[in-house]
């Protein structure tokens, strides 16, 4: 009943709780002397389903048969309507529509750890839409049965709060869950298990690693486990890897030797436990232990390259460059590089340790035969030295690669191709492709990049340190014994028209012609490799088309003569620059009047 129902009653048959699809009879009846005051036969009883009228009747009672009620709760209210007055609420009732519980499925129980408590889970099946009580029973030895009830709306988990111990590990226990509501009851199939079946060990803890004599080859992993653990799974991986190495061990007693770890690598280790070979389940993985393995002496050899620069008649500058060893080759933190420079005929040698750089520059005499050796050192030792004889890399013209080209290959890549040298191509031992940003001043501080290519290759894709809209000077060297030949080309991965034209800084007259001088376009405004400059001129105040002179771009050139100007005529001159993508806007304008005699 939903209110005091002083004026009448609402009765529901067969019950306030019905099975989905059932029919109910609802009766609303007035108590004596509770009708309309003057004309009792004027009583109009109205039945509402929620706020919607579904039936009415004149008299002291109303009967209504209701079908098709939905799952859940439906509210029925009976009201009395008298002439010239508002409807008066008489009484009401809630009807609960649901279903009997389905048989609970997939009942399973687990005890987390030897000191944990038994908890069971199951699948309820479809919602009953009614108050449903679940009772979980656990029967075992000594004729004893534990039970616990759950009165939550959605109950699919219960913890008994009791702990099974391994006094009789083979003793059988049987769990069963029963669901009961007003429409029926249903029990799960019984689940029978032993202590060993349901105890899931706690994950191992207190994981440590030891390296005997600071060596990666003598490594032991230690951990602590619950007392009954028989099996362990170990998994480990470098911290930057997604793939695990897995090891299964039996009766490890909290320790295991690992033999295949890489030096100077941070690893993640995890361990899991199990009580029995084929019963029960594995524990969760332990918390991760992260540890770095010790260093070992470097393996591999440095990739070394060099550049020679003429200083004067007696001296030359040698710049050495080398690439870092890979992590797997360095096998530790590289503390320094050792560079040894030796004059081969006289036997003079000097050694220097370089820290923080991968290059070294020195000045040596132009005479003599020179060699260098470079090695990398960590705390455990040094790599094998890379030895190079210093030679004139471009001296042998017949070894120069032919038809060198450089073409853009997608974003920030340049494909360099060439043909083998005229001289016996089989004499080539390797090609080296070298590239550096083009700087008009020939700046030796510009970083040098290189890659090595096998003698049968005639192309190389360069992508390291390649930026869009920058011009690179690319050289291809063919090396054969103590000889080398080279060819060079300019190339860019992406280009567009230069952002500005050259700035004319001076115009001078010489014997009836003029010499124009200009400042180079700043590198960041060239937008790729420049192909040509154009010099434009026209008579001042003239509307005629300007004349022009196109000159090929050369790095060092910044002046050019013009001898087709008329004396005593004032001209306006300006310049542009071109890449393969187009022409720049024009640079500054300069006026000039040639003072020479007229023809």
């Amino acid at each position: 009943k939903i209110d005091a129902c002083k004026r009448g009653d609402v009765t529901v048959k067969p019950s306030h709780v019905i099975l989905l699809g059932s029919t109910v009879n609802i009766t609303c009846s007035l108590k004596p002397r509770q009708g309309c005051f003057h004309y009792s036969r004027r009583n109009k009883l109205i039945l509402y389903k929620f706020d919607r009228r579904i039936n009415f009747h004149h008299g002291h009672s109303l009967n209504s048969q209701v079908t098709g009620l939905p799952l859940g709760t439906t509210l029925f209210v009976c009201k009395l309507a008298c002439i010239n007055s508002d409807e008066i609420q008489i009484c009401g009732a809630e009807i609960f529509v649901g279903v009997a519980p389905e048989q609970p499925q997939n009942l399973s129980c687990i005890q987390k750890g030897e000191q944990g408590t038994v908890a069971c889970t199951w699948e309820r099946g479809r919602d009953t839409h009614l108050y449903t009580e679940y009772t979980l029973q656990l029967s075992g030895p000594k004729n004893l049965t534990w039970q616990k009830q759950c009165k939550d709306i959605y109950c699919d988990y219960l913890d008994f709060g009791i702990n099974l111990t391994p006094e009789s590990p083979e003793s059988n226990f049987t769990a069963k869950v029963t669901a009961v509501n007003s429409l029926g009851s249903s029990s799960s199939l019984p689940s029978t298990f032993t202590f060993l079946d349901i105890v899931r060990p706690l994950p191992p803890w207190d994981i440590r690693i030891k390296f005997q004599k600071a060596s990666v080859s003598r490594c032991t992993l230690y951990w602590r486990d619950e007392g009954l653990v028989l099996l362990n799974r170990l998994r480990y991986r470098p911290s930057n890897s997604r793939l695990w190495n897995m090891v299964n061990v039996t009766k490890a007693k909290g320790r295991h030797d690992l033999l295949d770890l890489k030096p100077f690598t941070e690893y993640e280790f995890q361990i899991s436990s199990k009580l029995h070979l084929y019963k029960g389940s594995w524990s969760d993985w332990s918390e991760s232990l992260r540890a770095q393995t010790p260093e070992e002496e470097p393996t591999g050899m440095l990739d070394v390259w060099y550049m020679k620069r003429h200083i004067d008649y007696s001296r030359q500058q040698i710049s050495l460059f080398w690439k870092n060893l890979s992590v797997s080759e360095a096998r530790g933190k590289i503390l320094h590089y050792q560079v040894t420079l030796q004059e081969l005929t006289g036997g003079k040698a000097m050694t220097q340790n370089i820290t923080g750089h991968t290059s070294w520059t020195t000045v040596i005499p132009r005479t003599g035969n020179w060699a260098v050796a470079v090695s990398a050192a960590n705390s455990k030792g040094s790599s094998l030295p890379t030895r190079i004889n210093i030679m004139n890399l471009c001296e042998a013209g017949l070894l120069a690669p032919r038809q060198v080209s450089a073409n853009s290959e997608g974003m920030d890549n340049i494909l360099v191709t060439w043909q083998p040298p005229r001289k016996d191509p089989s004499a080539v031992q390797e090609y080296v492709v070298e590239w550096r940003e083009l700087h008009p001043g020939g700046d030796t501080q510009v970083p040098l990049n290189w890659l090595r290519s096998r003698p049968y290759n005639v192309s190389a894709l360069i992508s390291e340190n390649i930026k869009s809209y920058i011009c690179y000077e690319i050289r291809v060297y063919a090396l054969s014994g103590d000889q080398g030949g080279c060819s060079s080309i300019l190339g860019n991965s992406k280009h567009k028209a230069p952002l500005s034209g050259p700035h004319i800084n001076a115009i001078t007259e010489e014997k009836g012609s003029i010499l124009i001088s200009w400042n180079s376009i700043p590198v960041q405004e060239q937008m790729g490799c420049l192909l040509h400059y154009r010099i434009y001129w026209k008579e001042r105040d003239s509307n005629s088309q300007p004349q022009l002179c196109e000159i090929p771009y050369r790095v060092s050139q910044n002046s050019h003569p013009i001898n087709s100007l008329q004396p005593r005529v004032t001209y306006v001159l300006w310049m542009t620059a071109l890449t393969a993508a187009g022409e720049s806007s024009h640079g500054n304008e300069r006026e000039f009047c040639l003072q020479g005699k007229a023809n």
């Epitope: 000191q115 408590t117 075992g140 030895p141 000594k142 004893l144 534990w146 039970q147 616990k148 009830q149 913890d159 008994f160 709060g161 009791i162 702990n163 099974l164 111990t165 006094e167 003793s171 226990f173």
Partner: nanobody, 122 residues
Framework: QLQLVESGGGLVQPGGSLRLSCAAS????????MGWYRQAPGKQRELVAA???????AYADSVKGRFTISRDNAKNTVYLQMNSLKPEDTAVYYC????????????????WGQGTQVTVSS
């Protein structure tokens, strides 16, 4: 120290009912499990019923459906409602309390009461 005092025993005819009470003089909030044991002359003490702080209950097969165990933490009391009593239920009934979680299938209590006699006879 926890003191347990049983009451409610007595003589009853077969089919009759009794309600045993066990009052703890200290707080039973720290007690995980409480139980009723019984010992008939010449027999070993056996667990009749137990209840944990979380509300799990246990019954020996011989009393299942006839006896009900409950606890009232506010009154520091545990009850055993015994219905449909049989002559074989005759024994001294002991109250038991265990501070630790139940560490075995059966209850092994830290604390015991002095016992109350239940006799079922016509």
């Amino acid at each position: 120290q926890l003191q347990l005092v049983e009451s409610g025993g007595g003589l009853v005819q077969p089919g009759g009912s009794l309600r045993l009470s066990c009052a703890a003089s200290g707080s039973i909030f720290s007690i995980n499990a409480m139980g009723w044991y019984r010992q008939a002359p010449g027999k070993q003490r056996e667990l009749v019923a137990a209840i944990t702080s979380g509300g799990s209950t246990a019954y020996a097969d011989s009393v299942k459906g006839r006896f009900t165990i409950s606890r009232d933490n506010a009154k520091n009391t545990v009850y055993l409602q015994m219905n449909s009593l049989k002559p074989e239920d005759t024994a001294v009934y002991y109250c038991n309390a265990d501070r630790d979680p139940i560490t075995s299938w059966y209850v092994r209590g830290d604390y015991w009461g002095q016992g109350t006699q239940v006799t079922v006879s016509s």
